[in-house]
Amino acid sequence: ECVTQLLKDTCFEGGDITTVFTPSAKYCQVVCTYHPRCLLFTFTAESPSEDPTRWFTCVLKDSVTETLPRVNRTAAISGYSFKQCSHQISACNKDIYVDLDMKGINYNSSVAKSAQECQERCTDDVHCHFFTYATRQFPSLEHRNICLLKHTQTGTPTRITKLDKVVSGFSLKSCALSNLACIRDIFPNTVFADSNIDSVMAPDAFVCGRICTHHPGCLFFTFFSQEWPKESQRNLCLLKTSESGLPSTRIKKSKALSGFSLQSCRHSIPVFCHSSFYHDTDFLGEELDIVAAKSHEACQKLCTNAVRCQFFTYTPAQASCNEGKGKCYLKLSSNGSPTKILHGRGGISGYTLRLCKMDNECTTKIKPRIVGGTASVRGEWPWQVTLHTTSPTQRHLCGGSIIGNQWILTAAHCFYGVESPKILRVYSGILNQSEIKEDTSFFGVQEIIIHDQYKMAESGYDIALLKLETTVNYTDSQRPICLPSKGDRNVIYTDCWVTGWGYRKLRDKIQNTLQKAKIPLVTNEECQKRYRGHKITHKMICAGYREGGKDACKGDSGGPLSCKHNEVWHLVGITSWGEGCAQRERPGVYTNVVEYVDWILEKTQAV
């Protein structure tokens, strides 16, 4: 059962796993949610009746029954983890805590103009978990405007104390606001020889990389595969760090793989969700339950629905035994990973999918697409929406992309002459315009947010957000697309598609079926040569064939230029402008979304 409200002046008795320090009960709840075993917590707020050494303690708790006895205690705030909830969860914490000093290892001290600048510095520093900033009213003159970057083993403060005229806060890496590079490559036959901060068992290098990503101290990892010569180290995932933030030494070793934490790109790739099945593999751990199940998929479902289950092993039924049902072993451990991984015993293992809700919905795999052909199939581009105006009559106006459950990203130029958001209708999950009838459900638009530097498409800033009146329930036919990571600025996208219901030639009409075209990106230098009369800025991105023939056209505006990278689709561009349509040596010009990630997040995450 999902319980989101906090219980004031209440303490849960027993079940303690560990104690951490958090600046608020709300953040204690987030820490509990992300902890592999925590189901409940008790936080102690500052209070004259409470010993100051206990202020800001966040006691993480577990219970076989998923609840614990409640005791009345002033200043105690208790609650439940969000593990039991189905809603999307984020570790992003933008709060600034006034007059609180969050203690940790102060590894960097510098002058900053503001707390915001200090927070940005922390966000863009690979080691930084949180910061404390002494304001210009701080009593000690030499400490004024000092920004202290801090880290700890757990990612949370080692203590929190009251201190006048300072503010503290957390890194915004988990808010997708870091400019740090996002290195997705996994290097085969490589060992990073740096200090290990932890080690866990993992079935493959991908899971190891994801574990490294959500481990607060891990910057890179080395994984020993099941073919690794030293038996005791097989399937071992070594979580590593270094002072520089990069591996100091790379050693060539067969059957080992290494890679980096995906912290700077975690909003656009799955890091919590280990959805694969591992055949002929047994995961060992503390046994929670043994249940009969028809298949390994059914076993995974059982594990996902059991809140304490972290991973499972399914042993298929012996012929005609137990109505064809096999045994499903639901398991857990102290860190969420198997204590040992065995091969060759016939089991099928995997992880709970309960943690998938901690990943961005946009990272979910969508169904395979039809290659070739220009007409799309249902569910092929589930983030694509058709934006209709009702003036003078109802019609398709522009494309757009779902980027959040209440947000559509589109082009600013679509709203020329649009007097009010009320006259707009957003339809999602649509393949054919003819499906849209008078009684077709739509999303009303609450607000149109146009970039305040927008003047005309050709001069850039052609970007707008639509805030919907109601939230989108994600399904196979309507779900978000990931924004590109700021750390991915140097990625060369090779699998890019433009989609829309727009014209197929300059003098045409809106198409009934959603059209798609695979289009190569063109460098800005090349694009500038083709548009001598315009300034192609770094905030624009171009795509098109030299010979023309495939391009976006009228009616496609605002729609996505979607590029697939590492199995995840990213919204690389927004269809903006071009000279004619599909003309030779006249590429289409798109708004370069990565350059507006900060703007998008500022507008969509505004309180």
Partner: antibody, heavy 117, light 107 residues
């Protein structure tokens, strides 16, 4: 069922003003544009303007922009057209009509306005 | 403004005849054209929308065609109750405009 019921005939003197009403029922009034159309005796149809009741957004034909004012009262689901500085040229039947999904699908019965001294 | 030119302005035909009325737009209106029927003393009624879609309840002897600038309303077999004035109108852009009407009579 959708119905648009317009106010009764009006006889006005030149220079006067008139306010016509159009009461809507059977649908969500705020969700559709309401248009006003003029038809002089034995003539064709002439568009005056439209209003979106949910936001009070309006559009007018240039010819009527200075004299016609469209308003809507969402609490009573009624649209109004105020026409000022009447002349004999304004003698006509005035229709309110709902812009449905793709076209003007429901029309009021019309209000006859006669301007005569 | 987009001018809608309707022709003929009047026509007389016999019951059972095939009747065609045309409407020409001064510029491209894609398919944002509607046809209305107006009987004496009554308000106009919608027959065709989107150039070729028959509105609910309209007999199938009425059909519309065309796109861009040239549009046609066809009555495949004229009936006595079809005596009326027919109007075309465009809703592609503001201001909305109508043809001057075609008065249809029975011979």
């Amino acid at each position: 069922q959708v119905q648009l019921v317009q106010s009764g005939s009006e006889l006005k003197k030149p220079g006067a003003s008139v306010k016509l009403s159009c009461k809507a029922s059977g649908y969500t009034f705020t969700r559709y544009w309401m248009h006003w159309v003029k038809q002089a005796h034995g003539q064709g149809l002439e568009w005056i303007g439209n209003i979106y009741p949910d936001s009070d957004s309006t559009n007018y034909d240039e010819k009527f922009r200075t004299r016609a004012t469209l308003t809507a009262d969402t609490s009573t689901s009624t649209a109004y057209m105020h026409l000022s500085s009447l002349t004999s040229e304004d003698s006509a039947v005035y229709y309110c009509t709902r812009m449905g999904f793709y076209a003007m699908d429901y029309w009021g019965q019309g209000t006859s306005v006669t301007v005569s001294s | 403004d987009i001018v809608m030119t309707q022709s003929p302005s009047s026509l007389s035909a016999s019951v059972g005849d095939r009747v065609t009325i045309t409407c020409k737009a001064s510029e491209n209106v894609v398919t944002y054209v509607s046809w209305f029927q107006q009987k004496p003393g009554q308000a106009p009624k919608l027959l065709i929308y989107g150039a070729s879609n028959r509105y609910t309840g309209v007999p199938d002897r009425f059909s519309g065609s065309g796109s861009g600038t040239d549009f046609t309303l066809t009555i495949s077999s004229l009936q006595a109750e079809d005596v009326a004035t027919y109007h075309c109108g465009q809703s592609y852009s503001y201001p909305l405009t109508f043809g001057q009407g075609t008065k249809l009579e029975i011979k």
